[in-house]
């Protein structure tokens, strides 16, 4: 007999063909011989089966010798052997209906686990293979678990259920609630305005919650809360902000913070947390601020950076249009008795300039 796999809530067409392409008597019954539907005259009649109100047939195909039964809004319990009686012959079709659902909400925080559960008819032994949007493959039986969701797991998961060499495909949309970036670094010259942006990696119809930015300045012994805010239907309102520095916050998404001036005492690392309404756990994004200062004091030209820099970054002092350069993998460089002219202080990573500051050295007579 033919095996057909269906999905819970879906529609399936069970085909039944007569050898002669003409309109003839036919009936569909279940394994208990209860009539579901059939022809009486030219009318489609329905039997006492619990399926009858969800079963249909296409009259337009009858004169092509096709007497399909279409079942709408499939249920797991519709799994059965169905018998089509046409032209004094019986065609059997085994229908197996499967359901695949996420155990929890499909909007999950980064790091949380996802469990998919397969509903299947008694006596079946299906296998399930799921592929994440990022191409990760996971196999299982009745349940499939993804222990720690990552940002790239957001999107449509495609799961294939296999039984009796037949397959049925499920698509499940998973939204991983996270910031677009885990970490970002802003490089600024002393005195410049600093813009911090925290774009979300998802969109929700209604977005409500509260957040806070904690800051650990490089020069400070402990971290402190710079700002707390509320988010209501994508509108941002500041609850509390420190006096120094006095941060400003945008009223709309993406979350946007402005520090009026980059100063060495602000250089360091911050952690922005966002707790969403009706969700356990918080979203996190780390943000770093690196500040550069170039100064001339008496016969000494100095360039310094503050904040979290990697040891492989190079700090250089270079006289414009001249070969004179001093470079170090350090947080400060200096030149004694510098030549007059425009000096450049450069912070670079493998040749790529991250930050530069110019300082003019005037001749001393």
């Amino acid at each position: 007999k033919k095996v057909v796999l269906g999905k819970k809530g879906d529609t399936v067409e069970l085909t039944c063909n007569a050898s002669q392409k003409k309109n003839t008597q036919f009936h569909w019954k279940n394994s208990n011989q209860i009539k579901i539907l059939g022809i009486q005259g030219l009318f489609l009649t329905k039997g006492p089966s619990k399926l009858s109100d969800r079963a249909d047939s296409r009259k337009s195909l009858w004169d092509q010798g096709c007497f399909s039964m279409i079942i709408k809004n499939l249920k797991i319990e519709d799994s059965d052997t169905y018998i089509c009686e046409v032209e004094n012959k019986k065609e059997e079709v085994e229908l197996l209906v499967f359901g695949l659902t996420a155990n929890s909400d499909t909007h999950l925080l980064e790091g949380q686990s996802l469990t998919l559960t397969l509903e299947s008819p008694p006596g079946s032994s299906p296998s399930v293979k799921c592929r994440s949007p990022g191409g990760k493959n996971i196999q299982g039986g009745r349940t499939i678990s993804v222990p720690q969701l990552e940002r790239q797991d957001s999107g449509t998961w495609t799961c294939t259920v296999s039984q009796d060499q037949k397959t049925v495909e499920f698509k499940i949309d998973i939204v991983v609630l996270a910031f677009q970036k885990a970490s970002s670094t802003v490089y600024k010259k002393e005195g410049e305005q600093v813009e911090f942006s925290f774009p979300l990696a998802f969109t929700l119809e209604k977005l409500t919650g509260s957040g806070e930015l904690w800051w650990q300045a490089e020069r400070a012994s402990s971290s402190k809360s710079w700002i707390t805010f509320d988010l209501k239907n994508k509108e941002v309102s500041v609850k509390r902000v420190t006096q120094d520095p006095k941060l400003q916050m945008g009223k709309k998404l993406p979350l946007h913070l402005t520090l009026p001036q980059a100063l060495p005492q602000y250089a360091g690392s911050g952690n922005l947390t966002l707790a969403l309404e009706a969700k356990t756990g918080k979203l996190h994004q780390e943000v770093n601020l690196v500040v550069m200062r170039a100064t001339q004091f008496q016969e000494n030209l100095t360039c310094e950076v503050w904040g979290p820099t990697s040891p492989k970054l190079t700090l250089s002092l270079k006289l414009e249009n001249k070969g004179a350069t001093v470079s170090k993998q350090a947080k400060a460089v200096w030149v004694l008795n510098p030549e007059a002219g425009m000096w450049q202080c450069l912070l670079s990573d493998s040749g790529q300039v991250l930050l530069e500051s110019n300082i003019k050295v005037v001749p001393t007579w």
Epitope: T11, V12, K59, S60
Partner: antibody
């Protein structure tokens, strides 16, 4: 609730090929047949043809020689191609879901054939 | 092809009136008939199928009857939102065919 969204070129020159696509959202793609219907002031509502998930098609004999309906089950989409168009093919084209009745329709695409 | 003929092609009526539209098939189609309502700029909307069954969400003032070749759509008490064009469609055999439409206008 199933939604059908359709798109395609709106202005064609005679002898060109009309091409429209319809995407099915939020409902079962399998088990149903997916139709194209057009509506013009002169001919009223005219059924063009249909396809199912397996690619089985039925066409209106009056248009059969010029019509191709195809399906992309990976995207839950189906498409219409009508070749050698003339001014008589100017109409609003609809995609629709059918078993026996057209119970869900696309928003319609106005196709104008003019030199 | 099965020809579907609707009458009248247009009808003027007032809110609260009872209106009947008829549809005749060129050959017997048992009860394989549907009725649709279409408002300007919109796609048709299924009202009645199997000649007399209601599509979900359709108000009970709409009713369908008939079998074989003659069918009727009745609106028992016209409401403002019912002014539209109505079409019948046969699903008995390919190609599916529609009536030419009946435009229901405010008197």
């Amino acid at each position: 609730q199933v939604q059908l969204q359709q798109w395609g070129a709106g202005l064609l020159k005679p002898s060109e090929t009309l091409s429209l696509t319809c995407a099915v959202y939020g409902g079962s793609f399998s088990g149903y047949y997916w139709s194209w219907i057009r509506q013009s002031p002169g001919k009223g509502l005219e059924w063009i043809g249909e396809i199912n998930q397996s690619g089985s098609t039925n066409y209106n004999p009056s248009l059969k020689s010029r019509v191709t309906i195809s399906v992309d089950t990976s995207k839950d989409q189906f498409s219409l191609k009508l070749s050698s168009v003339t001014a008589a093919d100017t109409a609003v084209y609809y995609c629709a879901r059918v078993i026996n009745w057209f119970d869900s329709w696309g928003q319609g695409s106005l196709v104008t054939v003019s030199s | 092809d099965i020809q579907m003929t609707q009458s009248p092609s247009s009808v003027s009526a007032s809110v609260g009136d009872r209106v009947t539209i008829t549809c005749r098939a060129s050959q017997g189609i048992s009860s394989w008939l549907a009725w649709y309502q279409q408002k300007p700029g919109n796609a048709p909307k299924l009202l009645i199928y199997d000649a007399s069954s209601f599509q979900s969400g359709v108000p009970s003032r709409f009713s369908g009857s008939g079998s074989g070749t003659d069918f009727t759509l009745t609106i028992s008490s016209l409401q403002t939102e019912d002014f539209a064009t109505y079409y019948c469609q046969q699903a008995n055999s390919f190609p599916y065919t529609f009536g030419q439409g009946t435009k229901l206008e405010i008197k």
